[in-house]
């Protein structure tokens, strides 16, 4: 089984009650935004056949991702919340940096993929669907890697 | 179609032991964690331990030593192996499937096997 | 480990009626709380998920909310088939997975 390094994130960065409130800020409105509510793109689908080691590397993957296809082509919409969630989100994305796994992780990259060609699918309202899901992101990031 | 039945239980010494077993049918045990649950009559819910999709184990404190949890892939099938066995044990036993959607949820359940433990 | 307090442990209610359940968490568990629903001699049944998710299949008079500590059921008009027992379950993440999963106590729903 592949063995999860540095996958950590200590539970101090989800505990700063402004910054939480913000990124769900953020979430709630580019949410009222998204008219395609039938698709979840953090759901059952992206953990399947993921083990609980592996949680981490997949959802710093889904971070990663976000972060450089999302966020930062959108960071002039959302204000002012997106100024200030993306760098939040952007120090967790530094300090999952070293986060590794050993072995084989295709079937990791499989789910983002899929996960990655709905958004591209579904164009703009991909993009504000996955920071209408920052929230579960949030979360997901915290349960997984903490 | 996902099916989990459990099956096993019985009748049971104190000091004796027994093996549960949860066939499930509808998904694969290597794409889901299971858990077991138990629930004393008349009484609440109480989580036993979890095997994960690598076959890694996970147990309530109260559990470890006397409880292993353990699968066959190949059966479609996972075990409940409890040892030294007490009255307080007695209880409906369920096995349920974990999902992780970003939080671990339990669905489906089995129907439950029971096990009663009496001289 | 996180302790679960659910209240009232039962309560009676009418077809009809407007019911809701509270579950009190020991810490904070943000919004890692699920609802199960028991009828008597079957399996629990997964109702909500995310403190607020309603599950595939569950009828939308049900709805939960609540984070941090303090959660709510609320059936908004209970119905014949809803007489049941109501547990709360929280998933605690970053302590031993020996605490990771806790249920409450449960609530049963009796009819008046």
């Known amino acids: 089984a592949p063995i999860s390094s540095h996958c950590r994130l200590d539970k101090s960065n989800f505990q700063q009650p402004y910054i939480t409130n913000r990124t769900f800020m953020l979430a709630k409105e580019a949410s009222l935004a998204d008219n395609n509510t039938d698709v979840r793109l953090i759901g059952e689908k992206l953990f399947h056949g993921v083990s609980m080691s592996e949680r981490c590397y997949l959802m710093k993957q889904v971070l990663n991702f976000t972060l450089e296809e999302v966020l930062f082509p959108q960071s002039d919409r959302f204000q002012p919340y997106m100024q200030e969630v993306v760098p939040f989100l952007a120090r967790l994305s530094n300090r999952l940096s070293t986060c590794h796994i050993e072995g084989d992780d295709l079937h990791i990259q499989r789910n983002v993929q899929k996960l990655k060609d709905t958004v591209k699918k579904l164009g703009e309202s991909g993009e504000i669907k996955a920071i209408g899901e920052l929230d579960l992101l949030f979360m997901s990031l915290r349960n997984a890697c903490i | 179609e996902v099916q989990l039945v459990e099956s096993g239980g019985g009748l049971v010494q104190p000091g004796g032991s027994l093996r549960l077993s949860c066939a499930v049918s509808g998904f694969s045990l290597s794409s889901y964690a299971m858990i077991w649950v138990r629930q004393a009559p008349g009484k609440g819910l109480e989580w036993i331990g979890i095997?994960?999709?690598?076959?890694?184990?996970y147990y309530a404190s109260w559990a470890k030593g006397r409880f292993t949890i353990s699968r066959d892939s190949s059966k479609n099938t996972v075990y409940l192996q409890m040892n030294s066995l007490r009255a307080e044990d007695t209880a409906v036993y369920y096995c349920?499937?974990?999902?992780?959607?970003?939080?671990?949820?339990?669905?489906?359940w089995g129907q439950g096997t029971l096990v009663t433990v009496s001289s | 480990a996180v302790v679960l307090t659910q209240s009232p442990s039962s309560l009676s209610a009418s077809v009809g009626d407007r019911v809701t359940i509270t579950c009190q968490a020991s810490e904070d568990i943000y919004t890692n709380l699920a609802w199960y629903q028991q009828k008597p001699g079957k399996a629990p049944k997964l109702l909500i998920y995310?403190?607020?998710t309603l599950a595939s299949g569950v009828p939308s008079r049900f709805s939960g909310s609540g984070s941090g500590t303090d959660f709510t059921l609320t059936i908004s008009s209970l119905q014949p088939e809803d007489f049941a027992t109501y547990y709360c379950q929280a998933v605690v993440y970053g302590n031993s997975a020996d605490s990771r999963y806790t249920f409450g106590g449960g609530t049963k729903v009796e009819i008046k």
């Open positions: 995310w403190a607020s």
């Open positions: 095997i994960d999709i690598d076959g890694s184990t």
């Open positions: 349920a499937r974990d999902r992780f959607v970003g939080v671990d949820i339990f669905d489906p």
